[in-house]
């Protein structure tokens, strides 16, 4: 019996088609993805093949103005329209708190939303009961398939799930649910979830009875053969894991941003064992037409976005200096504003010993593309912020050793004076450079804000200590020559859309007046 699994993950509100790098579509003839194009391909496969499931492995939320404005209603609407069969909860589904998940998505979705390792307690338990499930048994043809969900247990550090949701260890939580499915005579079981490729592989290895793992969170691109676009495969598709009980378990993920549709064909025997698995992600490029009815719906929903872009978010009473003449040479107040917003967006008081789990921010000066003049009545709009941060990136959470941070700050000024983009703006860091010294030895003082303290203060950076840092995804991926970050990072979790982070901060503060205050000397 053959099952076709179509899967997406980490779509991050790319409802409209995008450019090849998943930023705003400029030249339509070369654009990719989007729900209208996705629907065309899904329908084509549904017509051609008998047993098809369309699954999403989480993080539909967060990433473009679509989410900022519609707050998840757009996810429910278009996933319903595409007739998704199931979705796993990702960490970003909690970005607007539990209410921001329940009302727009959980209550509106016509498909099951799954996570076996999230347990509700207190007053939330009854409120959320039945709105998400640990597993769901889906009829497919004359067979049944069990889908069991999981979500990164790091979610309390990455999003805003509140205090009434407990995130358990994935493997510990999954095993009893899979066992339950087995007692219900469900012998074909897919683990669908959002914990990253390493955890996906562990689930395949450790959870008895899981036949296939469909994952997300790490934006992993897998491919067999010659890849069709710029993404470099992390392994073959599917990636085969030998389980502890001697089975071959296929593990898949489909990169991110709706650029690809994962396509996996699985052959099951009478006992639900996987006899064979093969497939590849399908690049959703312009050779696949956008479905006209979905496209028309997208255009209808778009109208509200255009109006939102020009509305006032808050005011500034000072000039926001985002000029390259400032931000690529010295501390600039636009850099300070953005870093302050990045830290504010990551306030998570999850431990009494820590005032926060992260206190540091770094930001490449070259990523700041425009100033904002306060002489327009001080008004700041989304449109203004899009000029400052035009690349559609995210502000991510990484873990780095002190020694890596030291290398990063040396790189920041290794060719100082040439107006290059690698000059770092900071938050929660005091750095002193001596530019008379030779490149690679110019950082003379590097103090960082403590986290395990009730009164935050600056202490010297320790080379062997592991620090959490908020930074643009561009830097986490080694951009602007920061290869040491990419090579040496110990953990990397994708964060919120850059403009959204700053816009939320400005809306919260109402009036802003960031200063140049001696962070960089």
């Amino acid at each position: 019996w053959e099952l076709t699994i179509l899967h997406t993950n980490d779509v991050h509100s790319r409802l409209e088609q995008t450019s090849e790098d998943s930023s705003k579509c400029v030249n339509a003839s070369r654009c990719m993805g989007g729900v209208a194009r996705l629907f065309t391909k899904v329908q084509q496969i549904r017509r051609a093949e008998p047993n098809v499931l369309l699954l999403d492995a989480g993080d539909q939320y967060q990433g473009t103005i679509w989410f900022t404005v519609y707050k998840g209603a757009e996810v429910a609407h278009f996933m319903n329209a595409l007739r998704y069969d199931a979705m796993a909860l990702g960490n970003h589904e909690f970005d607007n708190g539990v209410e921001g998940l329940i009302e727009p998505l959980l209550k509106e979705a016509k498909f099951p939303i799954l996570s076996a390792n999230i347990k509700a307690k207190g007053p939330l338990a009854s409120q959320i009961s039945g709105l998400y499930l640990p597993y769901k048994v889906l009829p497919v043809g004359d067979e049944v398939v069990g889908i069991v969900g999981y979500t990164s247990k790091e979610t309390p550090f990455l999003s805003n799930p509140g205090t009434n949701l407990v995130f358990e260890d994935e493997i510990t939580a999954l095993q009893p649910e899979v066992d339950k499915l087995k007692t219900l005579n469900v012998n074909k079981i897919i683990a669908l979830g959002h914990s990253g490729f390493e955890m996906d592989k562990l689930i395949a290895q450790k959870v008895r009875g899981v036949d296939v793992v469909v994952g997300g969170h790490s934006n992993t691109f897998l491919y067999t053969g010659n890849p069709p676009s710029k993404e470099v495969p992390a392994g073959k598709y599917p990636f085969i894991v030998t389980s502890d009980d001697g089975r071959k378990v296929p593990v898949v993920q489909a990169y991110a941003f709706g650029k690809y549709l994962g396509y996996l064909k699985i052959e099951f025997d009478e006992r639900g064992n996987v006899i064979s698995s093969h497939g590849n992600p399908i690049l959703l490029n312009s050779s696949i037409p956008e479905d006209p009815s979905i496209k028309a719906d997208i255009n209808k929903w778009r109208i509200k976005l255009d109006n939102y872009s020009t509305q006032e978010l808050g005011k500034t009473i000072v000039y926001l200096d985002g000029s390259s003449q400032s931000c690529r040479f010295r501390e600039c107040n636009m850099g300070n504003l953005i870093c302050d917003a990045m830290i504010n967006n990551n306030l998570r008081h999850t431990d009494e010993m820590f005032w926060n789990h992260v206190s540091m921010c770094i930001l490449n000066g070259g990523g700041i593309r425009s100033p904002i003049d306060e002489r327009n009545n001080g008004t700041i709009t989304w449109e203004n912020l899009a000029a400052v941060l035009p690349f559609g990136g995210t502000f991510d959470l990484v873990q780095l050793k002190g020694s890596t941070l030291k290398k990063a700050f040396e790189h920041s000024v290794h060719r100082y004076g040439q107006s290059t983009g690698e000059f770092l703006q900071v938050g929660g860091i005091h750095v002193v450079y001596d530019l008379s010294r030779k490149p690679g030895d110019r950082v003379v003082k590097l103090d960082v804000l403590c986290t395990k303290c009730r009164v935050p203060s600056y202490d010297p950076l320790k080379m062997d200590e592991v620090y959490k840092v908020i930074l643009p995804n561009f830097l986490a991926n080694g951009g602007d020559g920061f290869q040491m970050i990419k090579d040496e990072l110990l953990r990397h979790d994708s964060g919120d859309q850059d403009i959204n982070v700053v816009s939320t901060y400005i809306s919260k503060m109402k009036v802003i007046y960031p200063a140049v205050e001696g962070r960089i000397k």
Partner: antibody, heavy 113, light 106 residues
Amino acid sequence: EVTLKESGPVLVKPTETLTLTCTVSGFSLSSYGIQWIRQPPGKLLEWLAVIWSGGSADYNAAFISRLTISKDTSKSQVVLTMTNMDPVDTATYYCAGQYGSVWGQGTLVTVSS
Amino acid sequence: DIQMTQSPSSLSASVGDRVTITCRASQDIGDRLNWLQQKPGGAIKRLIYATSSLDSGVPKRFSGSGSGTEYTLTISSLQPEDFATYYCLQYAGSWTFGGGTKVEIK
């Protein structure tokens, strides 16, 4: 639980037709095929026929004129008939799932006058 | 038809021995190979499917490997209950079996 069970006569006379039934539980014949295999005493396993989930059938070329396989999906039963039986057809007859994950316990059929 | 050549046809071994049985297909069968165990009573049980995946409840001393036309069943440490006849079965085309290997007590 996935099980298969063969049933039919234990003794048939030469030239007669053998009719064997395989009753399936735990999976659907609309999703999976059924294979028939036999093993003469002290000899090797020999594949006879398969009926696929869609209803089409394939036969061992050596027996194609003598074999017919059919199924009743609603009853979860597959029937194999073998005409013109001969003493050399004495064997244990097994039905098995399409992929061999499950086998019946086998039924010994003796061809003798 | 695809022919399956299994060797040896029989072997004598002691408890604790490592036993290897091989099957050669007349053409590439693309990992579509099972290993079956038949006890003297006649009951047939699949041990390994798709070349190397272990069936539920089968001890880990059994392992399968191979690709293309060459396939191997290994019993890492023979136990008393393992004395039986073993068959390879290809399902890339119409089923064909190897000639069987009878594993006897030395």
